[in-house]
Interface confidence: low
């Protein structure tokens, strides 16, 4: 009777062979069967599991002229680039009638030079700072022994005698290369060469040396940089995340830090043209020929208050008998802090000066002594912050008020205002 018609008789007339080879090898497994009637689809198993995405081809050859005659079916499984995951027991599987038929097994094995699962990676490290490198390789054949090399010099007397998967490096003072060799019975494989670039250590002790309303002087201690001298340090400064820009009547501050380069030594830098009474954040990194260190943490710093840069303006002083009415407007120049109030001074030709603290009001009525007999009376006004008094206005003479006349206004010559604080600041 033709093959495949009886449940107990296997239709397979050719079973898969064996393949043993190194990684990357291309090979083919074949099985052949003879069946009566319509040819079945042949499936492949690896270690008993159906290979869903097998690269297989099936060839069918009729042995007679009738569809119900015998057919020869050949299935070929191509293994394109042998990997460890391809190793195992392979069989063909067909469904005939109501029964599964499985071929005799063939075996795929891997044997060759070691294969790297993990190789040392390029990285940057701070000078004199410990770090680890990793290397992992496998056969078969096992065992695989590793030998680490630094700048092409072995770090152990023989494979397997030194550190294996993880190499602990206590620190470097120059840029170095590392690789590892994997040894097994078939020979030696060398990993990629990792370049470990030695960067300067993060600067330490970033601190304020001095503070002025529009100026900060900062200093820091450089970290070790190995055999590579520092070429420069980079300082970044940014306005702290608050509403200073809005309070100063300017648009929101830009979000990117301003970046400045400092020649070294000295490890010190003066930041000028800052906003007074304003919080900033600063940080620093130092660079050698190998690259930059990591940044320090952002250091919060604050400029102190300053005195107003200009006097009050539009001062008007009018006299009516024993009373004088004085009013003014806020200085147009930057206040350099929080305005706490105004001081007013008035003086006659032959009388001592009278000094008054007006507070935050911008007008005052003065009670004059002696029914207005004091001659050549003049008034000066200054604004003040916690840092002190700003410049006094030019003296304004008191003018007699006559009914029906507008009160005289003395438009003082304005001082040149300081430049608007725009970004960048210096």
């Amino acid at each position: 009777a033709p093959r495949g018609t009886q449940a107990e008789e296997s239709p397979f007339v050719g079973n898969p062979g064996n393949i043993t080879g190194a990684r990357g090898l291309t090979g083919t497994l074949r099985c052949q069967l003879q069946v009566q009637g319509e040819p079945p689809e042949v499936h492949w198993l690896r270690d008993g599991q159906i290979l869903e995405l097998a690269d297989s081809t099936q060839t069918q050859v009729p042995l007679g002229e009738d569809e119900q005659d015998d057919w020869i079916v050949v299935s070929q499984l191509r293994i394109a680039s042998l990997q460890l995951s391809d190793a195992g027991q392979y069989q063909c599987l067909v469904f005939l009638g109501h029964q599964n038929f499985v071929s005799q097994p063939g075996y795929v094995g891997l044997e060759g030079l070691p294969y790297f699962l993990e190789e040392p990676e390029d990285r940057t490290v701070a000078a004199n700072t410990p770090f680890n490198l990793s290397c992992q390789a496998q056969g078969p054949p096992e065992p695989v022994d590793l030998l680490w090399l630094q700048d092409a010099v072995p770090l152990a007397t023989a494979p397997g005698h030194g550190p294996q998967r993880n190499l602990h490096v206590p620190g470097l003072n120059k840029t170095s290369s590392f690789s590892c060799e994997a040894h097994n019975a078939k020979g030696v494989t060398t990993s990629r060469t990792a370049t470990i670039t030695v960067l300067p250590q993060q600067p330490r002790n970033l601190h304020l040396v001095s503070r002025q309303p529009t100026e900060l002087e900062v200093a820091w201690t450089p970290g070790l940089s190995g055999i590579y001298p520092l070429t420069h340090c980079t300082l970044q400064a940014m306005l702290s995340d608050n509403e200073v820009g809005i309070q100063a009547g300017e648009p929101d501050p830009p979000e990117e830090p301003l970046t400045l380069q400092a020649s070294v030594p000295p490890h010190q830098l003066r930041l000028g043209s800052l906003h007074p009474h304003t919080p900033y954040h600063i940080r620093v990194a130092c660079t050698s020929s190998q690259g930059p260190s990591s940044w320090t943490h952002w250091l919060p710093v604050e400029t102190p208050e300053g005195v107003p840069l200009g006097p009050p303006e539009n001062i008007s002083a009018t006299r009516n008998g024993s009373q004088a009415f004085v009013h003014w407007q806020e200085p147009p120049a930057p206040l350099q802090g929080t305005l706490l109030g105004y001081r007013l001074a008035y003086q006659g030709q032959d009388t001592p000066e009278v000094l008054m603290d007006i507070g935050l009001r911008q007008e005052v009525t003065l009670e004059l002594q002696g029914d207005g007999s004091v001659s050549n009376l003049t008034v000066c006004v200054a604004a003040y912050t916690a840092a002190g008094d700003g410049p006094w206005s030019l003296p304004v003479p008191l003018e007699a008020w006559r009914p029906g006349q507008a009160q005289p206004v003395h438009q003082l010559v304005k001082e040149t205002s300081a430049p608007a604080f725009s970004w960048p600041w210096w």
């Epitope: 940057t124 830090p257 990591s294």
Partner: antibody, heavy 117, light 107 residues
Framework: EVKLVESGGGLVQPGGSLKLSCATS????????MYWVRQTPEKRLEWVAY????????YYPDTVKGRFTMSRDNAKNTLYLQMSRLKSEDTAMYYC??????????WGQGTSVTVSS | DIVMTQSHKFMSTSVGDRVSITCKAS??????VAWYQQKPGQSPKLLIY???TRHTGVPDRFTGSGSGTDYTLTISSVQAEDLALYYC?????????FGSGTKLEIK
């Protein structure tokens, strides 16, 4: 308010040329490096060119070098990208972006360029 | 050029869930990583820079973390409006380069 508005995109035949513009407002244009970035139909973002704030330095990837030229007019607050010898793989949405010290913090709405015969 | 790899092309999540999108740099970029969000029909918008600093106006459910070569954008409680493409980008060395993007889908 920072605003970037691209224009000049359209349909062009392979080998043809196109000039994109990016009008900016709301910030001091001459203080910032600027970028052209394109987004392919597969949604991949690729930088196309950047230019320094003064316009003295430009940088291009190999894919466009010799074919694209980026320029700026700081007086007009405008950025340009002159594209020539266009290829089908240049088909993309082109964005101009402002480069701050840490990232591209503001982008335009984009202008579409299609290279097809 | 530095290569930025986003291994997940798509991520599916539900409203209220916590989700983390990862990005790997081909070399140490010393926390110089930005994250962008691109909603359908819009241009990319900056979310995070210097690995963990939120850009102005970005909700605090978005946080960034990471160092060396591995970086993560985390959304602590996903909202429906977070459906978008998310890109990482290194700003360590010009030319700045982007990851290929991760599409966040809401179940």
């Amino acid at each position: 308010e920072v605003k970037l508005v691209e224009s000049g995109g359209g349909l062009v035949q392979p080998g043809g040329s196109l000039k994109l513009s990016c009008a900016t407002s709301g910030f001091t244009f001459s203080d910032y490096y600027m970028y052209w970035v394109r987004q392919t139909p597969e949604k991949r973002l690729e930088w196309v060119a950047y230019i320094s704030n003064g316009g003295g330095s430009t940088y291009y990837p190999d894919t466009v070098k010799g074919r694209f030229t980026m320029s700026r007019d700081n007086a007009k607050n405008t950025l340009y990208l002159q594209m020539s010898r266009l290829k089908s793989e240049d088909t993309a949405m082109y964005y101009c972006a402002r480069l701050s010290f840490y990232a591209m913090d503001y982008w335009g709405q984009g202008t579409s360029v299609t290279v097809s015969s | 050029d530095i290569v930025m790899t986003q291994s997940h092309k798509f991520m599916s999540t539900s409203v209220g869930d916590r989700v983390s999108i990862t990005c790997k740099a081909s070399q140490d970029v010393t926390t110089a990583v930005a994250w962008y969000q691109q909603k359908p029909g819009q241009s990319p918008k900056l979310l995070i820079y210097w690995a963990s600093t939120r850009h102005t106006g970005v909700p605090d459910r978005f946080t960034g973390s990471g160092s060396g070569t591995d970086y993560t954008l985390t959304i602590s409680s996903v909202q429906a409006e977070d459906l978008a493409l998310y890109y990482c980008q290194q700003h360590y060395r010009i030319p700045f380069t982007f990851g290929s993007g991760t599409k966040l889908e809401i179940k």
